[in-house]
């Protein structure tokens, strides 16, 4: 079993290379008893879900942009 399924993580893998224009929203789940890792779960414009690598510079930019747009709404 992977580390993810050993706990109750939702991200079993992370998707590499996703264009920000395909992302509708992003949810960042902090570590907790259910999962030891930070998880970044994107809802795509086609309704599907994808896990993103929280350490990736582009993902950090996407999160920052999404959070800023939430604040301005």
């Amino acid at each position: 079993a992977s580390v993810a399924t050993e706990l109750r993580c939702q991200c079993l893998q992370t998707l590499q290379g996703i264009h920000p224009k395909n992302i509708q929203s992003v949810n960042v789940k902090s570590p907790g008893p259910h999962c030891a890792q930070t998880e970044v779960i994107a809802t795509l414009k086609n309704g599907r879900k994808a896990c993103l690598n929280p350490a990736s510079p582009i993902v950090k930019k996407i999160i920052e942009k999404m959070l800023n747009s939430d604040k301005s709404n």
Partner: antibody
Framework: EVQLLESGGGLVQPGGSLRLSCAAS????????MSWVRQAPGKGLEWVSA????????YYADAVKGRFTISRDNSKNTLYLQMNSLRAEDTAVYYC??????????????????WGQGTPVTVSS | DIQMTQSPSSLSASVGDRVTITCRAS??????LHWYQQKPGKAPKLLIY???NLESGVPSRFSGSGSGTDFTLTISSLQPEDFATYYC?????????FGQGTKLEIK
């Protein structure tokens, strides 16, 4: 056919012990988390405990922590709930449930998509 | 712990009615919410997963929506077999928690 079958329920005195079993068939048991959920007479659903696919991680509701132990034997496709120091408030129907399902290669959700028929536990003197 | 509050706790409706049940979480849970149906003496049955996805084999008259803290289960046109108790459940974090249930009765 995917199936879960609980057994081991019954009448027990306060302070007593009971071990519930849940026999699984029709799916790769070791790949999925499993949960126990209970329902007291005339009440709603209450989550009791969960266990990861390998059995390496376990989770408990505060009400049963330190008294109940969840475990699994993947070679026998069986889930267990060892219940010690039983109290009147533990009286309920106990269900085991499978936690499915993979949506995408990159994302997993935990929904109780298959349930057993339930086994009644009565704690009374 | 995350508390889940359903409303109403009971509801009387007629065949053909449109019915909405709401579920509120005590903190944001994204869309980590499921809906179950339970009939007397039977095990619960998964209806909707991740707030809005219809479980395989569930009639399309059932739908779910919401994100964050507020969620709804809608039955577009009640059928006789839909009279049951409905529960929401969060899996955002442990301990997993259910709403107290909404009993749907025939008017």
């Amino acid at each position: 056919e995917v199936q879960l079958l609980e057994s081991g329920g019954g009448l027990v005195q306060p302070g007593g012990s009971l071990r519930l079993s849940c026999a699984a068939s029709g799916f790769t048991f070791s790949e999925l988390s499993m949960s126990w959920v209970r329902q007291a007479p005339g009440k709603g659903l209450e989550w009791v405990s969960a266990i990861s696919g390998s059995g390496g991680s376990t989770y408990y509701a505060d009400a049963v922590k330190g008294r109940f132990t969840i475990s699994r034997d993947n070679s026998k496709n069986t889930l267990y709930l060892q219940m010690n120091s039983l109290r009147a408030e533990d009286t309920a129907v106990y269900y085991c449930a499978r936690e499915g399902g993979r949506l995408e290669p990159y994302y997993y959700y935990y929904a109780m998509d298959v349930w057993g028929q339930g086994t009644p536990v009565t704690v009374s003197s | 712990d995350i508390q889940m509050t359903q409303s109403p706790s009971s509801l009387s409706a007629s065949v053909g009615d449109r019915v909405t049940i709401t579920c509120r979480a005590s903190q944001s849970i994204s869309d980590n919410l499921h809906w179950y149906q339970q009939k007397p003496g039977k095990a619960p049955k998964l209806l909707i997963y991740d707030a809005s996805n219809l479980e395989s084999g569930v009639p399309s008259r059932f739908s779910g929506s919401g994100s964050g803290t507020d969620f709804t289960l809608t039955i577009s046109s009640l059928q006789p077999e839909d009279f049951a108790t409905y529960y929401c459940q969060q899996y955002y974090s442990t301990p997993l928690t259910f709403g107290q249930g909404t009993k749907l009765e025939i008017k």
